[in-house]
Interface confidence: low
Amino acid sequence: DAEFRHDSGYEVHHQKLVFFAEDVGSNKGAIIGLMVGGVVIA
């Protein structure tokens, strides 16, 4: 599992919010969907 930068930005991609991450071979580890209170929960 790759670590994520806390200051990561995000973009909409295929109807999923995907956080920019370092050294992540797949977007799956960063798929979130909903961010509330600074915490990605879905």
Epitope: H6, A21, I31, G37, V39, A42
Partner: antibody, heavy 125, light 106 residues
Framework: EVQLLESGGGLVQPGGSLRLSCAAS???????PMWWVRQAPGKGLEWVS?????????TYADSVKGRFTISRDNSKDTLYLQMNSLKAEDTAVYYC??????????????????WGQGTLVTVSS | SYELTQPPSVSVSPGQTASITCSGH??????TSWYQQKSGQSPVLVIY???KRPSGIPERFSASNSGHTATLTISGAQATDEADYYC?????????FGGGTKLTVL
């Protein structure tokens, strides 16, 4: 012991209101995203609403949008669900649940790892 | 909205292997979790992030997620495993549950 305890359910007439509470204990409630999930009699699970650590950040299922309001009081370690304009189809057991978070990897999805015992809401005349 | 489809029921003999499927469009692109709900009780998380077991969940519970289908496998099913099982995944802005599968251990 990590625990969630719901209260506030009961019998209410269509168009009425109820406020559900969920008291948390045994974990750091403040940063934890929290869910309300319901289950109609003999039916499956349906998410209702979710809230993050900031009470201004929440979302709702279309079926309850504009009628239900989720909130939390982190000083009391308590989650709430204000339900207005209740309908017969809102009859269900309502569960609160904690979103499991690995705080070292805050952008990961895990699941709802702690659930309350549920409180029954019956909407009937 | 995104939908997850499960068979309504699955039967298994004690000691045998039970497989419960959960289907959704390009499901492998999403993380899937599984919940066990015994009669009259609250749901319990048994699998998260496709194939990981929370502490306290027996090793006989395993899962996979490939293509359009996630599968929960219970190896050496026991009478205590009789329950409803729900798959769950993320939708665009929230969480979605499958309709549930009733596992009967005959």
């Amino acid at each position: 012991e990590v625990q969630l305890l719901e209260s506030g359910g009961g019998l209410v007439q269509p168009g009425g209101s109820l406020r559900l509470s969920c008291a948390a204990s045994g974990f750091d409630f403040g940063p934890s995203p929290m869910w309300w999930v319901r289950q109609a009699p003999g039916k499956g699970l349906e998410w209702v609403s979710v809230i993050g650590k900031d009470t201004q950040n929440s979302t709702y299922a279309d079926s309850v949008k504009g009628r239900f309001t989720i909130s939390r009081d982190n000083s009391k370690d308590t989650l709430y669900l204000q339900m207005n304009s209740l309908k017969a189809e809102d009859t269900a057991v309502y569960y609160c649940a904690r979103e499991w978070m690995d705080h070292s990897r805050p952008y990961y999805y895990y699941g709802m790892d702690v659930w309350g015992q549920g409180t029954l809401v019956t909407v009937s005349s | 909205s995104y939908e997850l489809t499960q068979p309504p029921s699955v039967s298994v003999s004690p000691g045998q292997t039970a497989s419960i499927t959960c289907s959704g469009h390009n499901l492998e692109d999403k993380f899937t979790s599984w919940y066990q709900q015994k009669s009259g009780q609250s749901p319990v998380l048994v699998i998260y992030r496709d194939d990981k077991r929370p502490s306290g969940i027996p090793e006989r519970f395993s899962a996979s997620n490939s293509g359009h289908t996630a599968t929960l496998t219970i190896s050496g099913a026991q009478a205590t495993d009789e329950a409803d099982y729900y798959c769950s995944s993320q939708d665009t802005v929230t969480r979605v549950f499958g309709g549930g599968t009733k596992l009967t251990v005959l």
